[in-house]
Interface confidence: low
């Protein structure tokens, strides 16, 4: 993989770890929320980004060509950023400056930018069209989205931890 398209694995690892923490802070499983332990319906299950075995995010896949996996992660981050920008999170008091939600939003953007290859045009992707959610549905949707994001980020963080440990190029001393 050309040097220019290789991410700064250590920085990605640090940012993704921070993102995991922020996602949990934004939605720590509270006791009363457990009463709402709704089963993931088919539509939710199929329409959220999941890093799967065919995405090349396993150690061997990363070694062979990390770009395939990194593209999945980039698109997952864009997907969730799109959801956080949607009306589902509008009017959410937690979106006040420096709140966990606001920090999560900023960090998602930061990691996305870090993963965007410099020599690569910005990828365009069709995002899910969101029907205006009813006020009463929003807390439940927010909960589902954040739990799904937590799972996605946990895997992404493992990918970056592996990359930082095994794929970081040693610094070559200059003469």
């Amino acid at each position: 993989v050309p040097r220019s398209s290789s991410p700064d694995w250590a920085q990605c690892q640090q940012l993704s770890r921070n993102l995991c923490m922020l996602a949990w802070n934004a939605h720590a499983p509270a006791g009363h929320m457990n009463l709402l332990r709704e089963e993931e319906d088919e539509e939710t299950k199929n329409n959220v980004p999941r890093i799967q075995c065919e995405d090349g995010c396993d150690p061997q896949g990363l070694k062979d060509n990390s770009q395939f996996c990194l593209q999945r992660i980039r698109q997952g981050l864009a997907f969730y950023k799109h959801l956080l920008d949607s009306d589902i999170f509008k009017g959410e008091p937690a979106l006040l400056p420096d709140s966990p939600m606001e920090q999560l939003h900023t960090s998602l953007l930061g990691l996305s930018q870090l993963l965007q290859p410099e020599d690569h045009p910005r990828e365009t992707q069709q995002m899910p069209s969101l029907s205006s959610s009813q006020q009463w549905q929003r807390p439940l949707l927010r909960s589902k989205i954040l739990r799904s994001l937590q799972a996605f980020l946990a895997i992404a963080a493992r990918v970056f931890a592996h990359g930082a440990a095994t794929l970081t190029e040693p610094l070559v001393p200059t003469a």
Partner: nanobody
Framework: EVQLVESGGGLVQAGGSLRLSCAAS????????MGWFRQTPGKEREFVAA????????YYANSVKGRFTTSRDNAKNTVYLQMNNLKPEDTAVYYC???????????????WGQGTQVTVSS
């Protein structure tokens, strides 16, 4: 209507080569990945390789790594699977499939071709 049409299958001697094509039509596939799968009677469909339309990133199953190469021609809306050093165990029906990149649920490939038979004789 979306259509994926595979071609290029056939009978080949062990050690030989074949190139499969998958012509895609009916929609824009810019945000899709194209996967190659294979299936032998009585066995589950097995992932072989995948390529992303947007940047050409590829990924291969361990069993074909170093022997198979997938590529795409955006102008022709076609993806290819170049199979070299074929072995008898590569005998199967080969399918191409398309999957939205923003949805990663496995194996939710939205569209499938009808398949093309590849037979490798020893």
């Amino acid at each position: 209507e979306v259509q994926l049409v595979e071609s290029g299958g056939g009978l080949v001697q062990a050690g030989g080569s074949l190139r499969l094509s998958c012509a895609a039509s009916g929609r824009s596939f810019s945000d899709y990945a194209m996967g190659w799968f294979r299936q032998t009677p009585g066995k589950e469909r097995e992932f072989v390789a995948a390529i992303s339309w947007s940047d050409g990133s590829t990924y291969y199953a361990n069993s074909v790594k170093g022997r198979f190469t997938t590529s795409r021609d955006n102008a022709k809306n076609t993806v290819y699977l170049q199979m070299n050093n074929l072995k008898p165990e590569d005998t199967a029906v080969y399918y191409c499939a398309a999957r939205r990149l923003v949805y990663y649920s496995d194996p939710k490939y939205d569209y499938w071709g009808q398949g093309t038979q590849v037979t490798v004789s020893s």
